[in-house]
């Protein structure tokens, strides 16, 4: 019997300081570039090695960015989202959604990491 794949969704506020080469990541998404089906949100597609985001360590590829400095990223064109990050200033506050894949074991069996075992 196959295990079921679930997702644990968490939100986090990440404060980044713009480095010499910027914030150090790439994005996909927007109302004109739906990367995820039926979702025009903005997602992190690449973290630049040794960039500000990589050195901070909390932002991950696949994270959805909900807001920048309190400004909602809903219903934005892709290029407008890029511009928003570029013009966000030196100290940048990101509200992000992490989506962690959780692999459950077959029904009736405890997973290896189940603390109740």
């Amino acid at each position: 019997m196959n295990g079921r794949v679930d997702y644990l969704v968490t939100e986090e506020e990440i404060n980044l300081t713009r480095g010499p080469s910027g914030l150090g990541f790439n994005i996909v998404g927007g109302t004109d570039q739906q990367y995820v089906s039926n979702d025009s949100g903005i997602y992190v597609s690449r973290i630049k090695e040794n960039g500000a985001a990589a050195l901070d360590g909390r932002l991950q590829e696949g994270d959805k960015i909900l807001s920048v400095n309190g400004q909602d990223l809903k219903n934005l064109l892709h290029q407008d989202a890029v511009d928003l990050f570029r013009n966000a200033g030196y100290a940048v506050s990101l509200r992000v959604q992490h989506r962690l894949q959780v692999q459950n074991g077959p029904i009736g069996h405890r997973g290896e990491g189940d603390p109740s075992g």
């Epitope: 910027g22 990541f25 790439n26 890029v82």
Partner: nanobody
Amino acid sequence: EVQLVESGGGLVQAGGSLRLSCAASGRTFSTYTLGWFRQAPGKEREFVGAITWSGSSTADSVKGRFTISRDNAKNTVYLQMNSLKPEDTAVYYCAAAIGSSVDSYYPSDPLEYDYWGQGTQVTVS
């Protein structure tokens, strides 16, 4: 994993034209930032130009002579090279990164790209 394959290089006389192609794998090709770089013998890799979701740009050394375009239906990016000069002789590389950089509209640093083709030789006599 993104794979890039360049083609179209060759030997051309000064003043002539060539069109390089770079075919890419991946279902989200339209979101890629794609760059063209070149490397002449004994020299560092040089930025030629890039194309993103919203536009393209070329380096000052080739501006007005080279243009970059893409065909998302064919997963291919092109480098049209006109008025070629002997100093354009180099191996030309296609590079890709998924998504758009939030730091640079047209990234010119090779470190901004994760995937590279094998290169195609252009010789201008």
